[in-house]
């Protein structure tokens, strides 16, 4: 169950999709990727307050136990719910190939 | 790619499966669950240092960008990679039913 999308901490503070610009050097890819030279990396960043975008029953349990035992049980964490595919032009032993990666860019986010 | 399982922070400090004992009251389930009275909740807890149990390419990117921009990009987070099903005896309008939940107990963990 995907729970409430209202962020009690204020606009933009809770778990959501962010875009971070990164070069091949930033990503440590310069030695094996030729293109793109820069990637608009979409990732999930933000707090997961009680029941905000809870991914499933496990996330709801985590919220309850974090409230009881904050030093033992961490709050749920903002992670990708799904991904957008992306292609990379990458070096091979013999030249280059165009490779699709399905797990590289976050498409949307939830708390787990 | 599931990366290294060696924890550089010391035994038990990195992302792994933990068991937390919780009552129905702890979980906020007392009004709709009859049994079990207590649950051994398995959850994923621990740090996600560089490339430790990286779930996918996205986790590897997150590690790289966290190193570069620690105030903007959080480290990967320890979350369930899969779940174990669990049955609950729950109250219904007419009595009780046995319900299976597939997303309640973490089975194993990774960093994402």
């Amino acid at each position: 169950a995907r729970n409430g999308d209202h962020c009690p901490l204020g606009p933009g503070r809770c778990c959501r999709l962010h875009t971070v610009r990164a070069s091949l050097e930033d990503l440590g890819w310069a030695d094996w990727v030729l293109s793109p030279r820069e990637v608009q990396v979409t990732m999930c960043i933000g707090a997961c307050p009680s029941q905000f975008r809870a991914a499933n029953m496990h996330a709801q349990i985590k919220t309850s136990l974090h409230r009881l035992k904050p030093d033992t049980v961490p709050a749920p964490c903002c992670v990708p719910a799904s991904y957008n595919p992306m292609v990379l032009i990458q070096k091979t032993d013999t030249g280059v190939s165009l490779q699709t990666y399905d797990d590289l860019l976050a498409k949307d986010c939830h708390c787990i | 790619a599931r990366n290294g399982d060696h924890c550089p922070l010391g035994p038990g400090r990195c992302c792994r499966l933990h068991t937390v004992r919780a009552s129905l009251e702890d979980l906020g389930w007392a009004d709709w669950v009859l049994s079990p009275r207590e649950v051994q909740v398995t959850m994923c807890i621990g740090a996600c240092p560089s490339q430790f149990r990286a779930a996918n390419m996205h986790a590897q990117i997150k590690t790289s960008l966290h190193r570069l921009k620690p105030d903007t990009v959080p480290a990967p987070c320890c979350v369930p990679a899969s779940y174990n099903p669990m049955v609950l005896i729950q109250k219904t309008d007419t009595g009780v039913s046995l319900q299976t939940y597939d997303d309640l107990l973490a089975k194993d963990c990774h960093c994402i």
Epitope: M86, I89, V96, L98 | -
Partner: antibody
Framework: QVTLQESGPGLVKPSETLSLTCSFS??????????VGWIRQPPGKGLEWLAH???????YFNTALKSRLTISKDTSKNQVSLKLSSVTAADTATYYC??????????WGQGTSVTVSS | DIVMTQSPSSLSTSVGDRVTITCKAS??????VAWYQQKPGKSPKFLIY???YRYTGVPDRFSGSGSGTDFTFTISSVQPEDFAVYYC?????????FGGGTKVEIK
């Protein structure tokens, strides 16, 4: 397996608008870094790049033809359309569409022949 | 627009010979030059990316080199199936532009 197939009218009258469709399979135009481009080749001549459209809907056009070209995509139907207005005999050519990954055009359709004549 | 000037426009050669085609850009394009092969009645086939990188599945007798404005495409030992027209293309900036083509014929 990646395939692209161009379709068009075959014959167009001068001053009319040429409409071409590229239907493709084996890849998605919602994939970051993917685009579809159009290239033409007049009979017995070389290749001329016309336009391309990217996954994020960014569009680029041949400078000389920009005012006459329109490109659009239907991601759900796996189709890209190209329109060329006010055609003349000089637009007679085989029109190709090609799959692009950034600046690579690695898969091409077999081409569709278009003649501009009254 | 960047003009790509290809030479020669045609050449005659025999099976087993070495063939070299040159392409000159009207301005610096770094290494952003691709090469294509086109056989009669067929669509172009992508061979070389970024001056020197062979694309997946392209035989190693095909190679490319160069940077800036001067580029070279070489077939080290021409095979019967290599008789075709070859085009260079700059992918440095849009509008992308092609050279005029080089027809490789049997002597």
């Amino acid at each position: 397996q990646v395939t692209l197939q161009e379709s068009g009218p075959g014959l167009v009258k001068p001053s009319e608008t040429l409409s071409l469709t590229c239907s493709f399979s084996g890849f998605s135009l919602s994939t970051y870094g993917i685009g579809v481009g159009w290239i033409r080749q007049p009979p017995g001549k070389g290749l001329e790049w016309l336009a391309h459209i990217w996954w994020n809907n960014n569009k680029y056009f041949n400078t000389a033809l920009k005012s006459r070209l329109t490109i659009s995509k239907d991601t759900s139907k796996n189709q890209v359309s190209l329109k060329l207005s006010s055609v003349t005999a000089a637009d007679t050519a085989t029109y190709y569409c090609a799959r692009m990954g950034y600046d690579i055009m690695d898969y091409w359709g077999q081409g569709t022949s278009v003649t501009v004549s009254s | 627009d960047i003009v790509m000037t290809q030479s020669p426009s045609s050449l005659s050669t025999s099976v087993g010979d070495r063939v070299t085609i040159t392409c000159k850009a009207s301005q610096d394009v770094n290494t952003a030059v691709a090469w294509y092969q086109q056989k009669p009645g067929k669509s172009p086939k992508f061979l070389i990316y970024s001056s020197s990188y062979r694309y997946t599945g392209v035989p190693d007798r095909f190679s490319g080199s160069g940077s800036g404005t001067d580029f070279t495409f070489t077939i080290s030992s021409v095979q019967p199936e290599d008789f075709a027209v070859y085009y260079c293309q700059q992918h440095y900036s849009t509008p992308w532009t092609f050279g005029g083509g080089t027809k490789v014929e049997i002597k």
